[in-house]
């Protein structure tokens, strides 16, 4: 029997496999910013370089007794989870430890920043293979810590951070809230969110995925041959850092965007009981548990997409929400969601050379979310076509008029605030293939892309009877790029993508008074990439 | 993920009457002061002064030195603990919170963040 956590994240076909870079040596280096560690432990000796970096605050309390094994406990365990010979995820990986947490597990933002700068300097002085930085720590939201993570990520370093153990929104903590880090929540052996005393794993839109983080067996600093179990989002992050190290060991040229997309795509889906999370966070929290993905050679040129939620706009009348993709990703569609249903739609606009997804609150609304669908589309050329709102009673049509461009998403934005005078926008798949159709007072935005072998089609599913949500999924081999809710209910909450599922949400009151003839339709745009084929629209 | 979280951002654009010094009075602070929303996690007295992205190496040092000089005129001792060159331009400083208004008016300053604790998870 192998430890449950390794069984969970490493599929059977990987168990005996040794991950090696093409030239035969594992050149990936993991930097661990944590407590001091016991480098002589049987799990990690010979694999760990204990750097001379030390930037920690004084321990609290006059009677604090600095006991080496206690000081090393957290870091040693994590080093073992990442690269331990017998209980580690990436057994061959070399690891560098930087001490930024004291014997009580406390550090400072400034100490962490100096540690990150130390890594950057090391990188400049002696460029090496791929670097993974593990940040098994969390503090309150810090603009500068997030900015430092962004700067380091842009140099090609992959940062993995603990979501935090506060049973709270991870966006309120750093570095968990930095978009450029891979943020990891913790699950237990039953794939359920980890409870830690009265608290537990953080959650929300800033979490990228979950990984084992309860009763994780790893190196104990008590003795050089001891093992112990520890729990927390640090352990979960260490698993993902190990997975990333293995991915990079096989394919050293994988970028952060590719790594994140592949982690998400190949994770175990829908096993977490979302009821553990606060109701307002359930839709924002990914239902994903990490597993080691196969190499790109085994999976071919699959179109990979992820959903990125914005922060909540807030309730003011003109409040907007903005969702952004990573620089390497293409924004293929933009939708919006509001719990009250009072929203004025969504659109894509360019800000500083990058296309962003925006959503607008409506008068009396409690606020909106913008929902971006961010995809990896090799050699893509994407553009937005928009048409201002038509006169009353007329439809607005937008299609992709450039040769070989296909429709990947539609957005609709209403000029009027009076929700009663407008009908919902529509997507027409049969009568007008590849068109976005908006009803009165709606500006329509079509996201059009050209990429080698990219083909797309619309898939719709409608429900006439009472239903809180309507869903439609893209079939195997196709990837969801766009998701919209079509006319039917007098009030829809909006639409969003969950993995390959398009979810259209309907307001409770709208359900009650709807006539049977008014179907609410979830419309998905499903695309696939077939590098040998020409870009096309599939009817 | 890119919006500021539960975070305290305080505008400390105080009137610029700094000992009647012309160069100081001319510069009105547009920089902001930020600190952790959780009071128990704050480390008052230690601040990360973050400069504009294009700030040159020499300018970072000059800004830190200028802050020390101006603080000294007011009878305060400032300790520059670290200068950041490689990830972002800025410096870490130990000083009285009384000097925040002064620091925010320095040229090149984008924002100042009070240091705070992070914890093993």
């Amino acid at each position: 029997s192998i430890p449950w956590n390794l069984e969970r994240i490493i599929p059977a076909w990987h168990q005996t496999e040794e991950d090696r870079s093409p030239d035969g040596s594992s050149q990936v280096e993991v930097y661990l910013l944590d407590t001091s560690i016991q480098g002589a432990h049987r799990e990690i000796e010979g694999r760990v370089t204990i750097t001379d970096f030390n930037s920690v605050p004084e321990e609290d309390g006059t009677r604090f007794h600095r006991q080496a094994s206690k000081c090393d406990s957290h870091g040693t365990h994590l080093a073992g989870v990442v690269s331990g010979r017998d209980a580690g995820v990436a057994k061959g990986t070399s690891l560098h430890s930087l001490r930024v947490l004291n014997c009580q597990g406390k550090g400072t933002v400034s100490g962490t920043l100096i540690g990150l700068e130390f890594i950057r300097k090391s990188q400049l002085i002696q460029p090496s293979g791929p670097l993974v930085v593990l940040l098994p720590l969390a503090g309150g939201y810090s603009r500068i810590l997030n900015a430092a993570c962004r700067h380091l990520a842009r140099t090609g370093v992959v940062l993995v951070a603990a979501a935090g153990n506060f049973r709270d929104d991870a966006c309120l903590y750093s570095p968990a809230s930095a978009p450029e880090v891979i943020t990891v929540g913790a699950t237990n052996a039953q794939d359920q969110p980890v409870t830690l005393g009265t608290l537990g794993t953080n959650f929300g839109r800033c979490v990228d995925l979950f990984a084992p983080g309860k009763d994780i067996i790893g190196a104990s600093s008590d003795c050089s041959t001891c093992f112990m179990s520890q729990s927390g989002t640090s352990q979960a992050a260490a698993h993902v850092a190990g997975i990333v190290a293995r991915m990079l060991s096989r394919e050293p040229t994988l970028t952060l965007a590719e790594l994140r997309q592949r982690l998400i795509h190949f994770s175990t889906k829908d096993v977490i009981n979302m009821a553990w999370f606060p109701e307002d966070q359930q839709v924002l929290t990914p239902n994903l548990v990490a597993t080691l993905p196969p190499s790109t050679h085994e999976t071919g040129g699959q179109l990979l997409c992820r959903t990125v939620w914005s922060a909540h706009s807030g309730p003011t009348r003109t409040a907007t929400a903005t969702a952004r993709c990573a620089p390497e990703e293409e924004l293929l569609s933009c939708s919006s969601f509001s719990r009250s249903g009072r929203r004025r739609g969504d659109w894509i606009e360019a800000i500083g050379g990058q296309q962003v997804c925006k959503a607008l609150n409506a008068f009396g609304g409690e606020g909106v979310y913008a929902v971006a669908r961010c995809c990896l589309v090799p050699r893509a050329n994407c553009s937005i076509h928009n048409t201002p709102a038509a006169r009353a009673g007329l439809e607005t049509h937008v299609h992709c008029h450039q040769k070989d461009h296909v429709l990947t998403g539609c957005s609709f934005h209403w000029e009027v605030e009076d929700l009663s005078v407008r009908r919902q926008p529509a997507l027409r798949s049969r009568r007008q293939p590849g068109q976005c159709v908006g009803h009165q007072a709606a500006s329509v935005y079509a996201s059009c892309c050209h990429a080698p072998g990219l083909e797309c089609k619309i898939k719709e599913h409608g429900i006439s009877g009472p239903s809180e949500q309507v869903t439609v999924a893209c079939e195997a081999g196709w990837t969801l790029t766009g998701c919209n809710v079509l006319p039917g209910a007098s009030l829809t909450l909006g639409a969003y993508s969950v993995d390959n599922l398009c979810v259209a949400r309907v307001h409770d009151t709208a359900r009650a008074d709807r006539t049977s003839g008014e179907a609410t339709v979830a419309a998905a745009i499903c695309c696939r990439s077939r590098p040998s084929a020409k870009a096309s629209w599939v009817q | 993920q890119d919006e500021d979280g539960d975070y305290e951002e305080l505008m400390l654009a105080l009137p610029s009457q700094e000992d009647g010094l012309a160069d100081e009075a001319a510069h009105v602070a547009t920089a902001t002061f930020r600190r952790c929303s959780k009071e128990a996690w704050r480390l008052p007295g230690t601040y990360i002064v973050v400069l504009m992205e294009e700030t040159q190496r020499l300018q970072i040092e000059q800004t830190a030195h200028r802050l020390q000089t101006r603080a000294a005129r007011r009878g305060y001792v400032i300790k520059v603990l670290h200068i950041f060159y490689d990830l972002f331009p800025g410096f870490l400083v130990k000083m009285s919170s009384d000097l925040l208004g002064l620091a925010l008016k320095l040229p090149h300053v984008e924002y100042i963040e009070e240091d705070s604790f992070v914890f093993a998870q």
Partner: antibody
Framework: QLQLQESGPGLVKPSETLSLTCTVS??????????WGWIRQPPGKGLEWIGS???????YYNPSLKSRVTISVDTSKNQFSLKLSSVTAADTAVYYC??????????????????WGQGTLVTVSS | EIVLTQSPATLSLSPGERATLSCRAS??????LAWYQQKPGQAPRLLIY???NRATGIPARFSGSGSGTDFTLTISSLEPEDFAVYYC????????FGGGTKVEIK
């Protein structure tokens, strides 16, 4: 119950390689709960740990012997082996194999040598 | 490496007497210390682990105590089969054994 049995030549020439095998019966060497170790005892002297191995093949050696020791495992035969190269008369000893508990699963537990094989005397002489 | 020093080298006692064996470590081994018994021509047998825990099947007359650097093995009333060599062993930093204490019949 679990039993361990050492086997191999009782006489080795100086500068050659000493080779011993330990056969485990009454239990599986593939258990993730244990490591498997070699310990030696020169005549009339104390005990010295040589090294240990995990079923996965991970090896751990006494730093003073590291350059000369190789321990390997054959899970199909439920055996693990010791090779000690460039032997001298100082390597003359009774060589014991033993189970070192506990390994990775469970994480906590007695991490000691128990049980032991009955030992085999290896004499290094020309 | 951690050096374990056992004393006395030889202890001459009669059956029924109390035996007290000492083991001192060159640095702290916490409670990661074991005691083994070895009879002539036999392999060592685990008596005590983690300083004070009796191994399976070991009679109650054997007890261990101590932590850090000083440890004691006590045999409350010597039986004839208890006359043997006793070794201490640490696992704080890999594995090292003490030089042994021979308990012989007086």
């Amino acid at each position: 119950q679990l039993q361990l049995q050492e086997s191999g030549p009782g006489l080795v020439k100086p500068s050659e390689t000493l080779s011993l095998t330990c056969t485990v019966s009454g239990g599986s060497i593939s258990s993730s709960s244990y490591y498997w170790g070699w310990i030696r005892q020169p005549p009339g002297k104390g005990l010295e740990w040589i090294g240990s191995i995990y079923y996965s093949g991970s090896t751990y050696y006494n730093p003073s012997l590291k350059s000369r020791v190789t321990i390997s495992v054959d899970t199909s035969k439920n055996q693990f082996s010791l090779k000690l190269s460039s032997v001298t008369a100082a390597d003359t000893a009774v060589y014991y194999c033993a189970r070192e508990g506990s390994g990775v699963v469970p994480a906590a537990g007695p991490n000691w040598f128990d049980p032991w094989g009955q030992g085999t005397l290896v004499t290094v002489s020309s | 490496e951690i050096v374990l020093t056992q004393s006395p080298a030889t202890l001459s006692l009669s059956p029924g007497e109390r035996a007290t064996l000492s083991c001192r470590a060159s640095q702290s081994v916490s409670s990661y210390l074991a005691w083994y018994q070895q009879k002539p021509g036999q392999a060592p047998r685990l008596l005590i682990y983690d300083a004070s825990n009796r191994a399976t099947g070991i009679p109650a007359r054997f007890s261990g105590s101590g932590s850090g650097t000083d440890f004691t093995l006590t045999i409350s009333s010597l039986e004839p089969e208890d006359f043997a060599v006793y070794y201490c062993q640490q696992r704080r930093n890999w594995f090292t054994f003490g030089g042994g204490t021979k308990v012989e019949i007086k």
